[in-house]
Interface confidence: low
């Protein structure tokens, strides 16, 4: 005797997030007389996902008219498809009664969900580093599925092998999460460099999603001093120049001090940019000689970014 | 040896965008050693330098065009372009496509031939 | 932006003449300067770059000096050939920008 078998062709499927995913089942008789059902997992905590019989499943649609005597296509289309709807289905012909009874199950399908990743965030060191010095950058992207992936690093077009990632959850997830950190070295001339975070993964269709972060956010570049005395003017005034130069953020103070004494304080504002994206300052201090019996000590005292000062002393000539 | 070629409409309409290509061939536009910049010369004038764009898509943009100009860069065609938004007569010039070195020689030392651009209805 | 005053703005000079053209900045710009040729129709030539240092392949008899403000280009024996158009450019800070030009003609 023939026995009805409950035939799922497909052992997987896979689906795009937001599309529809088609379970196919073929039930090979039409008796004994009774409805299918549909669940995801197996057991008592499975889940039912449609029924001939009953309820309201307003995601899911017969791909055939279930009402037709002789229709042996029990497939489904499940609409809009997310994560969540990932797991395995199975097909299950029920003996018309009262209850129903359970005849036969499919072998199942595994829907699995080609989740596209999230955007990546790549974030920064939370404090400013120097050149030389190596600073970590964190690429974040998450909810996407399948689990395999591939993440690139890479600073001005350059890939960079220093880095360590991690897809979360080990096991079976319905969406996973990716997280690498790089280690940049930085450079004096990084102010206009970019770290770029590359994620490549099957739904992205060769197009890959990058994250990028500014190193303009993450290096110092402390300035250079140099002070330097112009000629003596007719009205016994000497003109003293504080040079300083290629320092990155703009962000400085610059004190001048005559023998130890503050004479003027000075903020840098504005200023045009360098073509590595430094930036240079002078300031000028007029000193009148005449006033002065001693030689007089100018110190250029400039506070970059927050860090401990720098000084720059020079000795004005008084002569007797 | 690197040579760069423009091209684009010579005829823009005033008010539309203007749209330009420049083709590098001989050598990589992903190369982290150029920048890659337009520059513009009106009608028996001199040279106006609109902006340009590193490999890591990093651009600057002349302050006076700023609000009108993007220039964005394509490795996988090895080429870059620039459009500039709401043309007026005043846009009308021949405009260059340049490489400049970030080390050595820091001029443009490899230009485009240029392309007159008109901007007329 | 840095301002470029380039003179004269044209001369007239002798085959075998020394010819030498200004450029000013409106302020230091160090040796960030570079000098370029453009004869008409055709794109700018860079000659020299960094002020002074001659761009390969480019004859000797073109040099190039000055620091800060005050710059110097000069033709040392001005040939036919040298008609053209020469800007000066400087890169010390953005916008680049060029001076408005010296064009070159023979007597």
């Known amino acids: 005797e023939e026995e009805l078998q409950v035939i799922q062709p497909e052992k997987s499927v896979s689906v795009a997030a937001g599309e529809s995913a088609t379970l196919n089942c073929t039930a090979t008789s039409l008796i004994p007389v009774g409805p299918i059902q549909w669940f995801r997992g197996v057991g008592p905590g499975r889940e039912l996902i449609y029924s001939q019989k009953e309820g309201h499943f307003p995601r899911v649609t017969p791909v055939s008219d279930p009402t037709k005597r002789n229709n042996m296509d029990f497939s489904i289309r499940i609409s809009n498809i997310t994560p969540a709807d990932a797991g395995t289905y199975y097909c299950v012909k029920f003996r018309k009664g009262s209850p129903d009874v359970e005849l036969k199950s499919g072998a199942g399908t595994e829907l699995s969900v080609r989740a596209k990743p999230s955007a990546p965030v790549v974030s920064g060191p939370a404090v400013r580093a120097t050149a030389e010095h190596t600073v970590s950058f964190t690429c974040e992207s998450h909810g996407f599925s399948p689990r395999d992936i591939t993440l690139k690093w890479f600073k001005n077009g350059n890939e960079l092998s220093d880095f360590q990632t991690n897809v979360d959850p080990a096991g079976k997830s319905v969406s996973y999460s990716i997280r690498s950190t790089a280690r940049v070295v930085l450079t004096r001339r990084d102010v206009h460099s970019q770290v770029i975070c590359e994620v490549a993964h099957v739904t992205l269709q060769g197009d890959p999603l990058r994250g990028t972060a500014n190193l303009s956010e993450a290096i110092r570049v402390p300035p250079f001093l140099e002070v330097t005395q112009q000629s003596m003017r007719a009205d016994n005034q000497v003109n003293v120049t504080c040079q300083v130069t290629k320092f990155y953020p703009q962000r400085l103070q610059l004190t001048w001090l005559e023998n130890g004494n503050v004479s003027r304080t000075e903020m840098a504002s504005a200023l045009p940019e360098n073509k590595d994206g430094t930036y240079n300052w002078t300031s000028w201090l007029l000193v009148n000689v005449s006033a002065h019996r001693d030689d007089v000590k100018l110190t250029c005292q400039v506070e970059h970014d927050g860090q401990p000062a720098v000084n720059k002393s020079f000795s004005v000539k008084v002569s007797a | 040896q690197v040579q760069l070629q423009e091209s684009g409409p010579g005829l823009v309409k005033p008010s539309q965008t203007l749209s330009l290509t420049c083709t590098v061939s001989?050598?990589?536009?992903?190369?982290?050693?150029?920048?890659w910049e337009w520059i513009r010369q009106h009608p028996g004038k001199g040279l106006e330098w609109i902006g340009y764009i590193y490999s890591s898509g990093f651009t600057y943009y002349n302050p006076s065009l700023k609000s009108r100009v993007t220039i964005s860069v394509d490795t996988s065609k090895n080429q870059f372009s620039l459009k500039l938004s709401s043309v007026t007569a005043a846009d009308t010039a021949v405009y260059y496509c340049a490489r400049e070195g970030l080390d050595g020689s820091y001029g443009s030392s490899a230009w485009g031939q240029g392309t007159l651009v008109t901007v007329s209805s | 932006d840095i301002q470029l005053t380039q003179s004269p703005s044209s001369l007239s000079a002798s085959v075998g003449d020394r010819v030498t053209i200004t450029c000013q900045a409106s302020q230091d710009i160090s040796n960030y300067l570079n000098w370029y040729q453009q004869k008409p129709g055709k794109a700018p030539k860079l000659l020299i770059y960094?002020?002074?240092n001659l761009e390969t392949g480019v004859p000797s008899r073109f040099s190039g000096s000055g620091s800060g403000t005050d710059f110097t280009f000069t033709i040392s024996s001005l040939q036919p050939e040298d008609i053209a158009t020469y800007y000066c450019q400087q890169f010390a800070y953005l916008p680049y920008t060029f001076g408005g030009g010296t064009k070159v003609e023979i007597k």
């Open positions: 960094d002020a002074s």
């Open positions: 001989g050598g990589s536009i992903s190369s982290g050693e150029y920048y």
